[in-house]
């Protein structure tokens, strides 16, 4: 019997097509992605084949201003749309609260919704009860096949689940549910979840009965051949882990932002194992038409979008210096603001011991693109920060040794006076540099926020302590030549969108004065 | 390499069927959808239907619907297009022509070479 | 069902020219259009796909364009061995339907 999973990850809430490296689409005949795209595809798979299950590993929400707007109804609706038959959920998709999980998505979603090892507590409990599962067994064809979910155990870091939510190891939530299908009668599993490679792989290898795991959080691409795009494959399309028991256990991911669609066969004998295993993530090109009825709905859809962008989110009684003459070589204002709101939106106080878990940001210079002049009535709109921040990115949490840090200081200057991007502008961080010593040699202080403390004050960085850093996508990824944080990040999750992040902020201080403040000096 | 062999030519009388197969080499054969094509004399083309050997899912044309019947053998990787009820208008050559339906290229990217089917009193 | 109209119907040009054919839907086919050339007691042969994409191994004098219901197959400088017949065929819904075909000929 063969089965066919089409599969999505951390579409990101790019509902409309995007350029090649998933930002806003510019020159159309060249986009990828979108909606109407993938629905043109998977419509065209299902006409061929039998048994095909169209599954979404988690982060639906955030990433674009369809998401600031419309806030997950947008997910509910296209999805319905193109009639997904299962989401698992994601980190992101708590990022408005357990609120803004259950009235847009939960109750509006005519597909199941799966996670195992998140355990609802105390009055929320009957509340969200039967909105989301621990699985779901699922008719194709004459057959069924269990679905069964996860969510990264880390969200209560990463998103706002509040206090109601436990999220447990997954292993250890995923064995039982999988158990209760096999005495169900059910010998198809398939583990659909949002905790990243690493644990794919792991719930491959530890969980009992599971025969296919479908990915998503560390945007992996596995492709087995020659890759058609930019992205470049951590390994085979499907990646095959040996289970404990011998099994072997196809895992697959299909990268990031509705850019492919994965696609995998796979055979499975009268008894429910896997004889065999094929597939690749499609590349959704611009030679893929976008499907008109869905393309119309989008149209329709988007007349809001446009009216937001230019709508007050607060005001600014200062101007917002984000010019290059200033953030690619001092403290600017605009660096300060940008950082204030990163560490703003990773507010959680998790534990006593610590105030928040997160006190340090970086920013590169020129990831700052432009101003923002005081004296148009102070107004900021959507469209003013989308000008400062154009690329489409997002400010991550990771992970990283202070030996990595005090190396990506020494980076920022080690060029200096040029104009170049990689001069960091910073956020619970003090820096003295002496430009005339060496490069490599010139941060002569580098004092850090402290983190478990009542009271935050600056400790000089410890080299070889770990620390949280929030910063952007560009830079975890090794941009600007920040080689040595992409090498040597110890963990990496992706966090919000940029804009949305200093939007957000602004809409909740409503007035804002950033200030240059001696986070950067020069002796 | 990818090649469609097609069989012989066929002279069939009005009210007959014909059957005329299409193997395929060099490719995985239940990967592709497979339409059938024919065209008269000096005529344009005009497609029949099409088959997904994978699935056994097949679509017609409305216009032959009831007459027109595809099908395929997937151990010998060969797909049938068997026509009944025939007509002199029937008359044409009838190719076969792969479809990848899971990349990109909307359009036939191989064909047979093309059966030549005479329908003639 | 969805009609192509091609046009025109036959076409004489010489070697060097740069000749163009237009294919009008009678629907909107959201760019799902191919190109097909045919030579006589031949199969067709792709050319484009997707209204614009050139097809593997067609020379680049081969060109197209368009979308919703307008498209268009341009030969920059035609060469001995284009002249042919060429259909443009609607892959949107089916049944797939194709034009009349424009002859190519030798002035």
């Known amino acids: 019997w063969e089965l066919t999973i089409l599969h999505t990850n951390d579409v990101h809430s790019r509902l409309e097509q995007t350029s090649e490296d998933s930002s806003k689409c510019v020159n159309a005949s060249r986009c990828m992605g979108g909606v109407a795209r993938l629905f043109t595809k998977v419509q065209q798979i299902r006409r061929a084949e039998p048994n095909v299950l169209l599954l979404d590993a988690g982060d639906q929400y955030q990433g674009t201003i369809w998401f600031t707007v419309y806030k997950g109804a947008e997910v509910a609706h296209f999805m319905n749309a193109l009639r997904y038959d299962a989401m698992a959920l994601g980190n992101h998709e708590f990022d408005n609260g357990v609120e803004g999980l259950i009235e847009p998505l939960l109750k509006e979603a005519k597909f199941p919704i799966l996670s195992a090892n998140i355990k609802a507590k105390g009055p929320l409990a009957s509340q969200i009860s039967g909105l989301y599962l621990p699985y779901k067994v699922l008719p194709v064809g004459d057959e069924v096949v269990g679905i069964v979910g996860y969510t990264s155990k880390e969200t209560p870091f990463l998103s706002n689940p509040g206090t109601n939510l436990v999220f447990e190891d997954e292993i250890t939530a995923l064995q039982p549910e999988v158990d209760k299908l096999k005495t169900l009668n059910v010998n198809k599993i398939i583990a659909l979840g949002h905790s990243g490679f690493e644990m794919d792989k792991l719930i491959a290898q530890k969980v009992r009965g599971v025969d296919v795991v479908v990915g998503g959080h560390s945007n992996t691409f596995l492709y087995t051949g020659n890759p058609p795009s930019k992205e470049v494959p951590a390994g085979k399309y499907p990646f095959i882990v040996t289970s404990d028991d011998g099994r072997k256990v196809p895992v697959v991911q299909a990268y990031a932002f509705g850019k492919y669609l994965g696609y995998l066969k796979i055979e499975f004998d009268e008894r429910g194992n896997v004889i065999s295993s094929h597939g690749n993530p499609i590349l959704l090109n611009s030679s893929i038409p976008e499907d008109p009825s869905i393309k119309a709905d989008i149209n329709k859809w988007r007349i809001k979008l446009d009216n937001y962008s230019t709508q007050e989110l607060g005001k600014t009684i200062v101007y917002l210096d984000g010019s290059s003459q200033s953030c690619r070589f001092r403290e600017c204002n605009m660096g300060n603001l940008i950082c204030d709101a990163m560490i703003n939106n990773n507010l959680r106080h998790t534990d006593e011991m610590f105030w928040n878990h997160v006190s340090m940001c970086i920013l590169n210079g020129g990831g700052i693109r432009s101003p923002i002049d005081e004296r148009n009535n102070g107004t900021i709109t959507w469209e003013n920060l989308a000008a400062v921040l154009p690329f489409g990115g997002t400010f991550d949490l990771v992970q990283l040794k202070g030996s990595t840090l005090k190396k990506a200081f020494e980076h920022s200057v080690h060029r200096y006076g040029q104009s170049t991007g990689e001069f960091l502008q910073v956020g619970g961080i003090h820096v003295v540099y002496d430009l005339s010593r060496k490069p490599g040699d010139r941060v002569v202080k580098l004092d850090v926020l402290c983190t478990k403390c009542r009271v935050p004050s600056y400790d000089p960085l410890k080299m070889d302590e770990v620390y949280k850093v929030i910063l952007p996508n560009f830079l975890a990824n090794g941009g600007d030549g920040f080689q040595m944080i992409k090498d040597e990040l110890l963990r990496h999750d992706s966090g919000d969108q940029d804009i949305n992040v200093v939007s957000t902020y602004i809409s909740k201080m409503k007035v804002i004065y950033p200030a240059v403040e001696g986070r950067i000096k020069f002796s | 390499q990818v090649q469609l062999v097609q069989s012989g030519a066929e002279v069939k009388k009005p009210g007959a069927s014909v059957k005329v197969s299409c193997k395929a080499s060099?490719?995985?054969?239940?990967?592709?959808?497979l339409s059938w094509v024919r065209q008269a004399t000096g005529q344009g083309l005009e497609w029949m239907g099409e088959?997904?050997?994978?699935?056994?899912?097949?679509y017609y044309n409305e216009k032959f619907k009831g007459r027109v019947t595809m099908t395929r053998n997937t151990s010998i990787s060969t797909a049938y297009m068997e026509l009944s009820s025939l007509r002199s208008e029937d008359t044409a050559v009838y190719y076969c022509?792969?479809?990848?339906?899971?990349?990109?290229?909307?359009?036939?990217?191989?064909w047979g070479a093309g059966t030549t089917v005479t329908v003639s009193s | 069902d969805i009609q192509m109209t091609q046009s025109p119907s036959s076409l004489s040009a010489s070697v060097g020219d740069r000749v163009t054919i237009t294919c009008k839907a009678s629907?909107?086919?959201?760019?799902?259009v191919a190109w097909y050339q045919q030579k006589p007691g031949k199969a067709p042969k792709l050319l484009l796909y997707?209204?614009?994409y050139r097809y593997s191994g067609v020379p680049s004098r081969f060109s197209g364009s368009g979308s919703g219901t307008d498209y268009t197959l341009t030969i920059s400088s035609l060469q001995p061995e284009d002249f042919a017949t060429y259909y443009c065929?609607?892959?949107?819904?089916?049944?797939?339907?194709f034009g009349g075909g424009t002859k190519l000929e030798i002035k």
């Open positions: 088959i997904y050997p994978g699935s056994g899912n097949t």
């Open positions: 065929q609607q892959h949107y819904n089916t049944p797939y339907t």
């Open positions: 629907q909107d086919v959201s760019t799902a």
């Open positions: 060099g490719y995985t054969f239940t990967s592709y959808g």
């Open positions: 022509a792969r479809y990848d339906y899971l990349g990109s290229s909307y359009g036939f990217d191989y």
């Open positions: 997707s209204a614009s």
